[in-house]
Structures are given as C-alpha cells and as structure tokens.
C-alpha cells in the first residue's frame, strides 16, 4: 500500500523566524525517516538535537523532533524529512520539506562576500545564478553591475527568488564583471559581491599518466590516459595521433572532473586491443582550447615474449655497516613484463623475517642495519603466466664498528684510585666486525697539576704506545690478548698488568677495525692515602695543649681542601671556616692540609671536618673528627703501692697507675733516689710499671712513685723486702 507523506509540524512551504530563537520541527511518518538540512547546520553542532520516538495511535507511527537552539541567519534553507529505504518508484511521495528563513536585521544575506567577491563561472547563453539569497523574504535586493549599471528583474530574463538569488536565464557578455547585491535594512546598506567569469582558453598542463616508454607484449592491450588541467572556465578538445591511425585501431573515451575547486581536469583514454609490431612507435595526445594548444607524447615498445636477465650490480659479496639508516641491496634486472619480486634471506622470505626489510622495485631496502642482517640474499624473479623464472644470490657482510664492553657497563662517575706500589690488572674487551685489534697507550698526568683534572690535560701532551717492554709510566708485567665469549659473542679481551703502581696517568685502550676506532680512558690515579681521603689527629689535646689535625686527599680526585668547624644552632648545622689553616702541601700523589690550634681551651671542642671537592662530580665531601678538649685534672692514684716481700733471684713488678688530665708523668724513686731504666730494671708503658728481674739484696728498700701533671702531683711508697740469701754468698 502507498505510504502517506511524512508530515511536518510547521505547515506551508516556508516559515520565518528570528535569529536567536529556537527552531522546533517535528516530522511524523509511517516509516523510519531522516532529516536533510542546510549545509551550515552541522549534524554535529551542539545547537542541534534530533530525538526519535514512537507516536500516534498505539505508538505505530515514527516521530522525530529537530531542535535547533539559537538559530542563526546562515542556518536559513530547506529542512526536509524523508523516508529511509523506499523503492525508487515511490520516491516522489516520500519527502516533506519547508524553507525556513532565519531573519537577522544585521545580516540580510545568508552568504556575505563583502571584501572578497565570490567567483561565479558563466557560459554565455546559459543560466547564471547570482546566489545572494536572503534571510527574510521581505528584504528588497538590488542587483548592480560595476561601474554604473543596475540589473532590474523583469520576471522573464532576470528573476528574483529570495531562496536562490537573481536568476539570469541566458547570460550575455553584459553580465561579465563585478555584480553586487545590495539591501538596505534599518538605514544600513549591506553588500555582497560576485565576480562573473567567462570561460577562457588556458591549458595549465597536459600529461600522459603512464610510464615512459610504454612496454607491452604482443597481443596485449594498450591503455594510455591523457590528462589536461585547465582553469575552471576553460573547455578543451583532445585528440590522439598514433602509428596505425589510418586503420583506426584505437578506441577513445573522454570524461571531465570538475570536483577540484581550482581547476578542471579532462581525461582522454586511448585503448588498442591485441597490440602488433605495427602499433609500436610514438603516441601523441593533443589538447586545444581556442587558439591555445599543448601536446605530450610517449613511445610504445612491443616485445615478442617474456624475458628476465639478472646480474650483480657490483660484486657478489657486498659490505655495509651496522647502524646505517638504510642500505639498498639491488640487482641489475632487465625484464618484461614486470616480474614478481621476492627476496630471500638465508633461504627465508626476507620481508616476513623483519619489518625492516622493504622491497622497492628490484631492490631490497634494509632499514637501520644491524649485524643480524649479514647473510645470503637471493632475488627470486618470476613471470608466472609465461613460466619464466630467474634467481641470483649475493652475500652481505655487515661490518660493526668496535665497541668496548667495559665502557658500556661502567657506571663509575669518577675514577678508581690505585694504592701506591700495588699490582693492577686492567682489561678492555672489544667487539666488532672484522675482529678489532687492541692497542694500549699511556698518557702521563702533568705533575705541576693541582687544580685541573688529569684527563683534561692539554692534547699536546702526547700519549705513548705501550708494549710489555715499555719503560713509559709504570712498570708493565705483561700485555695479553685472548678470545672470550660474552653475551654469546666472540669478544677480544686485552689485559694489561701493571707490576708496580707508582705514576698517575691515563691508560687508553684503543680498539680499531676498518669501520672505525673506539677508545676507553682508564684514569689511573695512584693514591698514598687510604680511599683517597684521610683525616689524622695526632692526639686528643687537653686544655692548654696544641690541637694538631691533618687532612690528606688524593690530588687527582680532590681539590679545594679546607678545614671547617661544624656547629649546631637551633637544630641547624652551620659551617664555619677556620682561619688558622696553613698552606696545603702538594706531594706526588696527594695534597695535605694541616690544622694546628695552639693552646686549646674547652671552647675549641667540636666537630672538625675536612672538606674537599670531587674534581669529577663536583660534589663536596666531608670527613669529620669529633674533638673533645679535656679539662685539666690533678693526678690521682688508682691504687697505692703496698709493702711486699719477694724471694731473692725472682722477679717483681710494682704498679703505679694514675689518672689525670693531661696524662700524668710517672717518676720512680728508691730510697729517695730517682730510678733510671737500666739492665734488669724495666719501666713499662708510660713508666706506670716498674719491673725488676732477678731480685738481689740491694733491691730491698723504700720504693716511691710520683705522678705529676700541670695540675699537681700525687705520691705513694712501699717497702720491698728481699728474702733468702744470694747465690753469690752461697757460692762463696
């Protein structure tokens, strides 16, 4: 049964509304439908919404409501609702449309071309539309032609249609030029400009879009496509001339493409079936537009049968380098028709093996070459329809610039230090193709150097090549090379053994092959200081004594040595520089900075730190020493001497342990005579013990010890009794 037209909520053929208002338009129909809208009403616009619903009795009808918020003048146009998927025979009855004017007093014309006119192409005798449609049907529009003409609508040749503009039924040369539509709204004059342009005779370009020369097998079909490009207002005639033209061998098809906004493109396609030898030769496409003329030609070759010849472009063994952005492996191929090309790598299809392999014509392009790309490459050429097959293999060697393994794995920000006199083993492991050779060099440090890094030494200070017998620098025990398999690769390991580390400098190992050279600098800095940084306190002083601190740093690793005192104020550690520092003493391997504070007091207690800057990292290093100045204290004995008896010829020890600050000096007396160390009488550490070996009768008496310091002294005495008779008397 016949479908009833969809029905719009707004009746009539047109409707006027004000800009800024909301347009509500409902379409009700008996089937699913869609909207067709003016070009400027974007379906994606945020202003626009379309809601679908079931409606009518029992919800059997289809409804769709279009809402356009804040409608604008340029939304003026046809709004139509049509059924989806309706048989073509019923198309006429399945659409309802309304033209909606969105009136805006500030914008009488839907499209405004005020500064830059819109160009309109015209052909004399044909209809010409000046499309100055308006946003309200009540607007009066005048059509003027520069300089002084006004074109008045007569209802026949010139018609005004508020939905289209001015329609000129058969344009003449009089309508060529600048045409202006004018409208006065609220006393304001609005203009929109159009520039009409007559067709010209310009031919921009002519091309045959087929490779030159054209090659073909006998009996095959030739198709040549000739393209002429012209300005929009040009028409052309295209003709062909060719070898067997007299027998009208060719068929020609023509078409025009006007979709480009800047040019027309005309096509003429020549086709000849079952090409013969007589069809070979020059084919010319001629393009004419009035007096203008251009032509283009191509030559056509005919072959009797398919063939392939393939040769090496250079030699059979090719070389490239790893890391190359792109390498083209190509063969010299002559063939017709174009063969199918497949490249194999080591017998497997190359392009399947890696995305880095691309086939371009008869070449294989390897992107970002790696050493895995080395191998045998075979080009397989086939013209299957003619059963013609050829292949050829080339070998690709991928050379690799040497790399030094230790250089890649080393993460030390600054150099190692080597203890003075030590034996050291230095190793460089290199990899490359071809196998690199490794040479060792010695670059001595400048010994005047104090502030500069050794590895920044000027280049005019030469480096010396080394071998096991070299007498440059440190004594070398041996230089040996061996192969080592690391990470599955054969690498060359070269070991230099330094027998006796005495001289600072830089050992350089250089690995070279024909691709290039790489070097590794091993900073070889001798240290006579443990860990390259050492702080020494002569002794912890007591009030009134001298504080003597020394800081020794490796001179190649540290600079800017200074003593500072750390104090904590309000939970913040403050650094105070110390003015009593002496000049640093630079020796062969180290720098020493002494700090002497004479006659210390308790206030000199604190954390003393030696600060130096790492030459390599720029980092400041501190080594701290906690100094506690002790208060003076008069001596006191830990235990008094006590009388005791000892057997003759045996030995005895007398202890006089005293404390005090500073440490007391102990003096021994026997019968009020000072005891000196002599054979048989030994004074122990700090004289705090008196040891008498092989006691004799003469050793009997009063022993007295005295402990003395700046604060005073303390004494103790005891009587030593010797028992028994002497050997001497016995012998007698």
């Amino acid at each position: 049964s016949k479908l009833k037209d969809p029905e719009l909520s707004l009746k009539g053929t047109q409707h006027i509304m004000q800009a800024g208002q909301t347009l509500h338009l409902q379409c009700r129909g008996e089937a699913a439908h869609k909207w067709s809208l003016p070009e400027m009403v974007s379906k994606e616009s945020e202003r626009l919404s379309i809601t679908k619903s079931a409606c009518g009795r029992n919800g059997k009808q289809f409804c769709s409501t279009l809402t356009l918020n804040t409608a604008q003048a340029n939304h003026t146009g046809f709004y139509s609702c049509k059924y989806l998927a309706v048989p073509t025979s019923k198309k006429k009855e399945t659409e309802s449309a309304i033209y909606i004017f969105i009136s805006d007093t500030g914008r009488p014309f839907v499209e405004m071309y005020s500064e830059i006119p819109e160009i309109i192409h015209m052909t004399e005798g044909r209809e010409l539309v000046i499309p100055c449609r308006v946003t309200s049907p009540n607007i009066t529009v005048t059509l003027k032609k520069f300089p002084l003409d006004t074109l008045i609508p007569d209802g026949k040749r010139i018609i005004w249609d508020s939905r289209k503009g001015f329609i000129i039924s058969n344009a003449t040369y009089k309508e060529i030029g600048l045409l202006t539509c004018e409208a006065t709204v609220n006393g304001h004059l609005y203009k929109t400009n159009y520039l009409t342009h007559r067709q010209t005779n310009t031919i921009i370009d002519v091309q045959i879009s087929t490779p030159r020369p054209v090659k073909l097998l006998r009996g095959h079909t030739l198709v040549l496509n000739c393209t002429a490009t012209t300005p929009l207002n040009t028409r052309v005639q295209m003709t062909w001339s060719y070898p067997d033209e007299k027998n009208k061998r060719a068929s020609v098809r023509r078409r025009i493409d006007q979709s480009n906004s800047h040019a027309n493109i005309f096509y003429s396609v020549l086709t000849i079936d079952k090409m013969q030898n007589k069809d070979k030769g020059l084919y010319t496409c001629r393009v004419r537009s009035g007096p203008s003329f251009k032509s283009v030609n191509t030559s056509v070759h005919i072959y009797d049968k398919a063939f392939i010849t393939v040769k090496h472009r250079k030699q059979q063994v090719l070389e490239t380098v790893a890391g190359k952005r792109s390498y083209r492996l190509s063969m010299k191929v002559k063939a017709f028709p174009s063969p199918e090309v497949v490249w194999l790598k080591d017998g497997l299809p190359a392009t399947e093996k890696s995305a880095r392999y691309l086939t371009r014509g008869y070449s294989l392009i390897i992107k970002d070459v790696t050493e895995e790309d080395a191998g045998n490459y075979t080009i397989l050429l086939s013209i299957k329809q003619s059963n013609v097959f050829k292949n050829l293999t080339a070998t690709l060697i991928v050379n690799v610039k040497p790399q030094i393994y230790e250089k890649a794995v080393s993460s030390f920000p600054d150099p190692a230090l080597y203890p003075l006199g030590s034996r050291q083993i230095l190793t460089c492991t290199a990899y490359g193709i071809p196998q690199p050779t490794i040479k060792w060099f010695w670059h001595p440090c400048n010994h005047n150097h104090s502030e500069a890094r050794c590895d920044f030494c000027s280049n005019n200070e030469e480096s010396f090549i080394l071998d096991a017998d070299s007498n440059m620098g440190n004594r070398i025990e041996s230089i040996t090379q061996r192969m080592a398999i690391i990470e599955g690769k054969n690498k060359m390991a070269s070991t230099l053994v330094v027998a006796d580390s005495r001289i600072s400098g830089i050992y350089i190992c250089i690995a070279s092959n024909k691709v290039g050279t790489v070097g590794r600098n091993i900073s070889f800095y001798i240290t006579d200081v443990p860990n390259g940084f050492h702080v020494n306190l002569e002794k912890m002083p007591t009030e009134g004594e001298d504080l003597k601190l020394s800081c020794t740093v490796n001179k190649f690793l540290y600079r800017d040595v200074t003593w500072i005192l750390l104090r904590t104020v309000n939970n913040r550690t403050m650094h105070y520089s110390i003015s009593k520092q002496k000049m640093a003493i630079t020796k062969e391997h180290s720098i020493t900075l002494n700090l002497t504070i004479m006659n210390v007091s308790l206030q000199d207690s604190g954390t003393y730190a030696c600060r130096a800057r790492n030459v390599y990292t720029g980092e400041e290093i501190l080594q701290k020493k906690e100094i506690t100045i002790r208060d003076q204290e008069a001596p006191y004995l830990l235990r008094n001497l006590s009388d005791h008896t000892v057997a003759i010829s045996s030995s005895t020890t007398l202890d006089c342990h005293a404390n005090g600050v500073p440490e007391p000096q102990i003096t021994w007396f026997k019968n009020n005579h000072k005891i000196q160390q002599e054979p048989g009488i030994i004074l122990g550490p700090g004289s705090s013990t008196l040891f008498i070996e092989r006691v004799t009768e003469e050793d009997e008496g009063v022993y007295h010890c005295k402990a003395t310091n700046q604060k005073g002294s303390v004494e103790s005495s005891a009587y030593l009794t010797v028992q028994g008779t002497s050997d001497k008397s016995n012998l007698e």
Epitope: E115, I116, P117, I119, K144, F146, P147, L148, G177, L178, T180, H188, L189, L195, P231, H262
Partner: antibody, heavy 116, light 107 residues
Framework: QVKLQQSGAELVKPGASVKLSCTAS????????IHWVKQSPEQGLEWIGR????????KYDPKFQGKATITADTSSNTAYMQLRSLTSEDTAVYYC?????????WGHGTTVTVSS | DIELTQSPKFMSTSVGDRVSVTCKAS??????VAWYQQKPGQSPKALIY???YRYSGVPDRFTGSGSGTDFTLTISNVQSEDLAEYFC?????????FGGGTKLEIK
C-alpha cells in the same frame, strides 16, 4: 569610463600634515571600496588602508594607524587621505586604487616630498 | 601580518623565453592573490586576480597559478614590452600586503 583622479604633488615641511584627494569618475564611490597604497624605493609597495564610503567603515595597516586618516565625501565622489607629523620616511608616491578584483583601476599617484 | 616573499628579486631573460616568478606567503591565503606589473614611471597595472584569473585585455602569455602559500606568475613567451617590475599582493586578510617585487630585464 572609470577613472581615479589624484591631487597634485606636495612639498611639505617635517612635522606638518597633508591631505591628498582621489576623485572618482565613471562610477559611484558608494558602490565600492577605495584603497590607498604607498610606494617608496626603500619599502616598495605598502598597503595603507581602505574605506567603505557609504558607512565610512575604515581598515588600516596598524603601521599607518595614527599616521593616516582616510575619509570620503560621497556627494563629491571623492576619497581623501590625511597624513600627519610628516618625516622624511613619508616621502613617497601615494596611490588610490580600487580593490584588486575590481579590474585595473589605480590613480596616477601623488608624490609627497618631506623636506625642510 | 602575512608576509609575502617574492623571488627572484632580479631576472634577466631574452625575448621568447619562459620565466616564472614565485611568491610565498607566511600563512595560508587560499587563492586571494593578485599580480601587478609596473613599468618605469607608471602606476601598477593588475594582471591576475584570485591567483589564476587574467584580467580582460591581459595577454594569455601571462599565467597565474597556486593556492594556499605558494604562487607563481609565468610569462611563457617574453616580449620586449614585458620589461617591468612585478608584484604579488594578498587580499585574504587585513592588512593587505605586497611582495618585495621582481625586476624583469630583457637581454
């Protein structure tokens, strides 16, 4: 026939002002825009600005804003351009012209020489 | 402002030759470009508008092409009367701007 007739050459002192005129014949200036262009050996051709005579709407190159003022008198079919605070850099030939797409209508030019 | 860079600045050619002048815009100007010819002591004369449209009366040996930022004026069969300076102009947006000019000299 369309013509743009420009006023004669001007010799002016630095700091002074000058008003150039451009009288149209063969068309009505209300129907188009009038443009002004400066040409000097140092700077070549420079667009100064334009006027839409019916509503006196003007556009200027910011470089000439404050230097040039374009006006129009539709009753006499004449456009004007006043140049103020003249210096030696303003020495040039000044053309009035129709827009680039209104075919080929340029005035013959007015030479302005600024010299003390 | 849109800058127009014209090249070359000078060009020497012989009668019958084909020459091209290029004009490069610093930003897209669509096809809103005009070309002018200025003979010594004369006002500029418009040759081409909208990049490729010849004004009536302009010989068809003058051809304009291009869109966007790259434009070309080609004189296909140079005549002695073509000795002049050639300028391009953009009128896509204010301020309108001109190229620096190309002087054509006939050998």
């Amino acid at each position: 026939q369309v013509k743009l007739q420009q006023s004669g050459a001007e010799l002016v002192k630095p700091g002074a002002s000058v008003k150039l005129s451009c009288t149209a014949s063969g068309f009505n200036i209300k129907d188009t825009y009038i443009h002004w262009v400066k040409q000097s050996p140092e700077q070549g051709l420079e667009w100064i600005g334009r006027i839409d005579p019916p509503n006196d709407n003007t556009k200027y190159d910011p470089k000439f804003q404050g230097k040039a003022t374009i006006t129009a008198d539709t009753s006499s079919n004449t456009a004007y351009m006043q140049l103020r605070s003249l210096t030696s850099e303003d020495t040039a030939v000044y053309y009035c012209a129709l827009p680039p797409f209104y075919f080929d209508y340029w005035g013959h030019g007015t030479t302005v020489t600024v010299s003390s | 402002d849109i800058e127009l860079t014209q090249s070359p600045k000078f060009m020497s050619t012989s009668v019958g030759d084909r020459v091209s002048v290029t004009c490069k815009a610093s930003q897209n100007v669509d096809t809103n470009v005009a070309w002018y010819q200025q003979k010594p002591g004369q006002s500029p004369k418009a040759l081409i508008y909208s990049a490729s449209y010849r004004y009536s009366g302009v010989p068809d040996r003058f051809t304009g092409s291009g869109s966007g930022t790259d434009f070309t004026l080609t004189i296909s069969n140079v005549q002695s009367e073509d000795l002049a300076e050639y300028f391009c102009q953009q009128y896509n947006s204010f301020p309108y701007t001109f190229g620096g000019g190309t002087k054509l000299e006939i050998k």
